[in-house]
């Protein structure tokens, strides 16, 4: 028979032969031959390969360096890499999560639209009319101005995006 020019899924072509790829979690030790099947070996401790492959070396698991604010979110297996995330109050600087930075706080006049996670920073939004924030915070949303009317009071000082309204008693004197 003619030697193959293409192989089935999970195979690779070498020396005019279709050899089985090694399954995830294993590395190639020896290509198949006319006499033998592909020889594969499991990856060692702290190593992985996440695809059907013909790699002769497994990849090292990612190290979650605590000096960079990282911790293990999910321990790696022979088939998956370790997933790092950031310590409380910090978030990743990139999708690969190679280092962390402190969550941003929203300044007075801004409130938290979305609280930060291990992988995303705080999202702030300006407090709209009727709302305010008088603190720098990574958690606080914009608060609504106090409704003086519901307290049977009147506005003595208008609110801003940074301050609440000031309510006062109604003037009882009538002309």
């Amino acid at each position: 028979p003619e030697p193959p020019t293409a192989c089935r899924e999970k195979q690779y072509l070498i020396n005019s032969q279709c050899c089985s790829l090694c399954q995830p979690g294993q590395k190639l030790v020896s290509d198949c031959t006319e006499f033998t099947e592909t020889e594969c070996l499991p990856c060692g401790e702290s190593e992985f390969l996440d695809t059907w492959n013909r790699e002769t070396h497994c990849h090292q698991h990612k190290y979650c360096d605590p000096n960079l604010g990282l911790r293990v979110q999910q321990k790696g297996t022979s088939e998956t890499d370790t997933i790092c995330t950031c310590e409380e109050g910090w978030h990743c600087t990139s999708e690969a999560c190679e280092s962390c930075v402190l969550h941003r706080s929203c300044s007075p006049g801004f409130g938290v639209k979305q609280i930060a996670t291990g992988v995303s920073d705080t999202i702030c939004e300006p407090c709209p009319v009727g709302f305010f924030s008088n603190v720098s915070s990574a958690f606080e949303k914009c608060h609504p101005w106090t409704s003086c009317e519901t307290k049977d009071l009147v506005v003595q000082q208008a609110g801003t995006n940074k301050t609440d309204v000031v309510c006062g008693p109604q003037d009882r004197l009538r002309a």
């Epitope: 028979p1 020896s30 031959t33 033998t36 099947e37």
Partner: antibody, heavy 115, light 112 residues
Framework: QVQLVQSGAEVKKPGASVKLSCKAS????????IYWVKQAPGQCLEWIGG????????NFNEKFKSRATLTVDTSISTAYMELSRLRSEDTAVYYC????????WGQGTTLTVSS | DVVMTQSPLSLPVTLGQPASISCRSS???????????LHWYQQRPGQSPNHLIY???NRFSGVPDRFSGSGSGTDFTLKISRVEAEDVGVYFC?????????FGCGTKVEIK
Amino acid sequence: QVQLVQSGAEVKKPGASVKLSCKASGYTFISYYIYWVKQAPGQCLEWIGGINPRNGGTNFNEKFKSRATLTVDTSISTAYMELSRLRSEDTAVYYCTRHGNGVYWGQGTTLTVSS
Amino acid sequence: DVVMTQSPLSLPVTLGQPASISCRSSQSLLHSNGNTYLHWYQQRPGQSPNHLIYQVSNRFSGVPDRFSGSGSGTDFTLKISRVEAEDVGVYFCSQTTHVPWTFGCGTKVEIK
């Protein structure tokens, strides 16, 4: 072209050891196992075992495991088989062989074990 | 161990005539990957073995097409369609499906 050149004939006394060599050329040595086969006069061929030069990993016929040692020296593309505690039944021609993209044999080494 | 039994032990043939050698294994040589690792080779007097066929029916490069292999499971055959003078020698079958790899004891092909 691929060549396997084996060491010369050996004559040994029972109980001694012998180390046979197989020098490879014409290909990347670490890419293919080297296997050893015994052909004794009037007997069937016997597979002794093989070694992967990439990592030194071996597989053996249990019959030979206790007395045969397979090694490689990748710096000189040479495989070795040491046979210990020799006895008269070890008298044979020993071949090294390689397969993958064709099968190649050494010319054989004749070992005679006699007192 | 897998026992490989060849027959006949000796095969006198006439030049230009066909020849057939049988090889039976004591267990199936079908590997879990779907391949059958049964091989044939020839050894001329005073020479190293020379492989003819691998995986039942695949001829090695340079092997004349008068040599063919067939069979499956435990029953295999090597055929020479028209024997030539250079075909004289001992023919072996071997299996590499199971460890240890094992060999038939050979069939001696000679000219009548």
